[in-house]
């Protein structure tokens, strides 16, 4: 988790002098509770936006937006703590809006936004906005939270972001797999425009089961420049196991931008269709 272009952070708006500060996610009001605390945020919304860095890179960001309730507690609102928690790693990043002037009611509802938390493809986040100071131990909560899942790199808009392109999202191998005679598979895919090696991972399964009955790895050396964007054809020999008929072929590239953590592409060959009609039973069964 990180912030995009840290220098450009602003939270001031007409009628409010405000500064954005780094936060330890442990506001002072936890340790020294105040008697009077503001009410919770209203209408918290989290949206996926895309933002360019000053270097021109494009990143997905969490756009956080909320409004204030129209009650007298606005007089005791000193700021807000914005927290983003990545759910699979428990990593948390916080910033604090510090109000440098007192808020006053005006003709329209106060609205705040922040779009500087960089989020990762295919990751889920819990976004929380805490009004400050935080409530006393048994006080009513004055925060709002939302969970938010970022699309993966296959999503059309995500595909062109810097983190996705770095992991090879623009490469479309257009894998085809055909079953040949004599227990063989012919795998064909389009090479990318980089002199890097590939690995084909074959995993075979019985018809309706998910435990593998055969695994094989095939190394493809780095192509020469004249082979870029050409089709690579590989024939894989299968193990002659009856019923080991569903094959998953996965292609792992080793691009320089993502090394052994590049996006993999896969294709599956299903087991041949079983005939719908059972074999006819003869009228009589011979005894010998």
């Amino acid at each position: 988790l990180r912030l995009l272009d840290h220098r450009a952070l602003v939270c001031s708006q007409p009628g409010l002098n405000c500064t954005v500060k780094n936060s330890t996610c442990l506001d002072d009001s936890w340790i020294h509770p105040r008697n009077l605390t503001p009410s919770s945020p209203k209408d918290l919304q989290i949206q996926l936006h895309f933002a360019h860095t000053q270097q021109g890179d494009l990143f997905p960001v969490a756009h956080i937006e909320w409004t204030l309730q129209t009650d007298a507690s606005i007089l005791y609102l000193e700021g807000a703590e914005l927290s983003v928690l990545q759910l699979n790693t428990n990593e948390r990043l916080c910033v604090r809006f510090e109000f440098l002037s007192k808020l006053r009611h005006h003709h329209r509802r106060w609205r705040f936004t922040f779009s500087h938390f960089v989020v990762d493809p295919d990751q889920e986040y819990e976004v929380t906005v805490h009004h400050l100071p935080k409530p006393i131990p048994d006080g009513d909560p004055n925060h709002q939270s939302k969970n938010f899942l970022v699309p993966d790199c296959e999503h059309a808009r995500m595909k062109v972001t810097t983190p996705c392109m770095s992991s090879g999202s623009l490469w479309d191998p257009n894998i085809t797999v055909e079953t040949l005679e004599a227990h063989q598979l012919r795998v064909s895919f389009t090479l990318w425009n980089e002199s890097t090696h590939y690995q084909i991972l074959l995993t075979s399964f019985p018809h309706m089961e998910n435990h593998s009955c055969f695994e094989h790895m095939h190394h493809i050396p780095a192509p020469r420049p004249e082979e870029f964007h050409q089709r690579s054809n590989v024939t894989l020999t299968l193990r002659n196991l009856k019923g080991c008929c569903r094959h998953q072929v996965q292609i792992q590239p080793f691009f320089s931008s993502c090394l052994n953590d590049c996006l993999r592409h896969s294709a599956t060959v299903s087991c041949p269709e079983m005939p719908d009609t059972p074999e006819p039973i003869p009228d009589y069964m011979p005894l010998w």
Partner: nanobody
Framework: EVQLVESGGGLVQPGRSLRLSCAAS????????MHWVRQPPGKGLEWVSG????????DYADSVKGRFTISRDNAKNSLYLQMNSLRAEDAALYYC????????????????????WGQGTMVTVSS
């Protein structure tokens, strides 16, 4: 014009099945997560199920888990809700809704994450 049109509702006996469909138009359907929300007669809105842009993740309200299945066909710009083992408490007006942003609201109150709602299709469960 951005539009969601639900169909497939009707009168069904308890324990039977029904399949709701939602036809989307006017936006890039395969960019957005979609949800089903229902409103029982005389009650408030209740989120039923959600699905990510490519169907990679599906979530369900506890009250329908194991009985309802959400799915989508991006080639047909369509969202579906297969409802099995229907109960009297499933009777409601079912809405197909689109997320406002490209992400997926996966927890907390999501109603303000939705920007386009269909007109709804009525499901009545009665013997």
């Amino acid at each position: 014009e951005v539009q969601l049109v639900e169909s497939g509702g009707g009168l069904v006996q308890p324990g039977r099945s029904l399949r709701l469909s939602c036809a989307a138009s006017g936006f890039s359907f395969d960019d957005y997560a979609m949800h089903w929300v229902r409103q029982p007669p005389g009650k408030g809105l209740e989120w039923v199920s959600g699905i990510t842009w490519n169907g990679g993740r599906k979530d369900y309200a506890d009250s329908v888990k194991g009985r309802f299945t959400i799915s989508r066909d991006n080639a047909k710009n369509s969202l579906y809700l297969q409802m099995n083992s229907l109960r009297a408490e499933d009777a409601a007006l079912y809405y197909c809704v689109k997320e406002r942003s490209l992400g997926y609201c996966s927890g907390g109150s999501c109603s303000d994450a939705f920007d386009i709602w269909g007109q709804g299709t009525m499901v009545t469960v009665s013997s």
